[in-house]
Interface confidence: medium
């Protein structure tokens, strides 16, 4: 492993739409590919007038926007559906809404996923 | 280096059968899903079923349900698409290729097709 | 069904040129959009996964943007071995689904 990178193995699994998917609804996930990519969780969700929905957690293929990231943090500003990618196992399993503004202080929105996970 | 051979097309008869196999090589296959896609001649590319890595969960396109079947052979390294009550319109180029997970359905290597022919 | 639609269905271009292949989802996919090349009586080519993230192996004059129901992918400078049909697909939900394909062609 690269010096100073936490190897993600394994994600919180969760799908809104598990019966159409045909998934679990809920679970972990161990994460494969191939061994020189480098493998993330991520999480994403709608705020539907302040409550959160999560729509999805897994894995996350090698994608240099979630690299060195160990925690799972949206900054885009007010997006429609919130998004988050991190490196670490079950990193996903809390995600947070942190946006990058110009003028006003950052707040923080940290979630903890409903439902919670399980083995 | 990651190999998928697909075999098994060939001339059939509307309402007969074929079995596709797609031997893989060079990764590991039980950590991947797979998947069945197919090009009719001078068109684009349609899905047409996935299995996950132990077989738990499969799906299929509304086109081939109820007459398609895929399964899987870890032990041989080996999918298969069982083609049943064929029609013209599967004729196409079949290609298998993998996926990384259930849901991360980007289909990274591909084979290089067989061709199913249905006619009279 | 989410429905895949692609523009142009072709284009003309010449080697060098900037060119720009869009696919629109009929509802949000977030970011589970992949495009892929292929070429004729070959298999696709996976070129860009997750919306942004170039395949192994895949020029860097290749790259893709967008989330949510609007997709882009860009050829930044137009080469000869580029010229083929590309497709968006989308892996958000079951059934998967293809864009009805972009071919560029020699201008």
């Known amino acids: 492993a690269i010096l100073g990178r936490s190897e993600t193995q394994e994600c919180l699994f969760f799908n809104a739409n598990w019966e159409k998917d045909r998934t679990n609804q809920t679970g972990v996930e161990p994460c494969y590919g191939d061994k020189d990519k480098r493998r993330h969780c991520f999480a994403t969700w709608k705020n539907i007038s302040g409550s959160i929905e999560i729509v999805k957690q897994g894995c996350w293929l090698d994608d240099i926007n979630c690299y060195d990231r160990t925690d799972c943090v949206e900054k885009k500003d007010s997006p429609e559906v919130y998004f988050c990618c991190c490196e670490g196992n079950m990193c996903n399993e809390k995600f947070s809404y942190f946006p990058e503004m110009e003028v006003t202080q950052p707040t923080s929105n940290p979630v903890t996923p409903k439902p919670p996970y399980y083995n | 280096e990651v190999q998928l051979l697909e075999s098994g097309g060939g001339l059939v008869q509307p309402g007969g059968s074929l079995r596709l196999s797609c031997a893989a090589s060079g990764f590991t296959f039980d950590d991947y899903s797979m998947h069945w896609v197919r090009q009719a001649p001078g068109k684009g590319l349609e899905w047409v079923a996935s299995i996950n890595y132990n077989s738990g969960y499969k799906g299929y396109a509304d086109s081939v349900k109820g007459r398609f079947t895929i399964s899987r052979d870890n032990s041989k390294n080996t999918l298969y698409l069982q083609m049943n009550s064929l029609r013209a319109e599967d004729t196409a180029v079949y290609y298998c290729?993998?996926?990384?997970?259930?849901?991360?359905?980007?289909?990274?290597?591909w084979g290089q097709g067989t061709l199913v022919t249905v006619s009279s | 069904d989410i429905q895949m639609t692609q523009s142009p269905s072709s284009l003309s271009a010449s080697v060098g040129d900037r060119v720009t292949i869009t696919c629109r989802a009929s509802q949000s996919i977030l970011r589970y959009l992949n495009w892929y090349q292929q070429k004729p009586g070959k298999a696709p080519k996976l070129l860009i996964y997750?919306?942004?993230s170039r395949a192994s192996g895949v020029p860097s004059r290749f790259s893709g943007s967008g989330s949510g129901t609007d997709f882009t992918l860009t050829i930044s400078s137009l080469q000869p071995e580029d010229f083929a049909t590309y497709y968006c697909q989308q892996s958000d939900n079951l059934p998967l689904t293809f864009g009805g394909g972009t071919k560029v062609e020699i201008k």
């Open positions: 290729a993998r996926a990384a997970n259930w849901h991360d359905t980007a289909l990274d290597y």
């Open positions: 997750a919306a942004t």
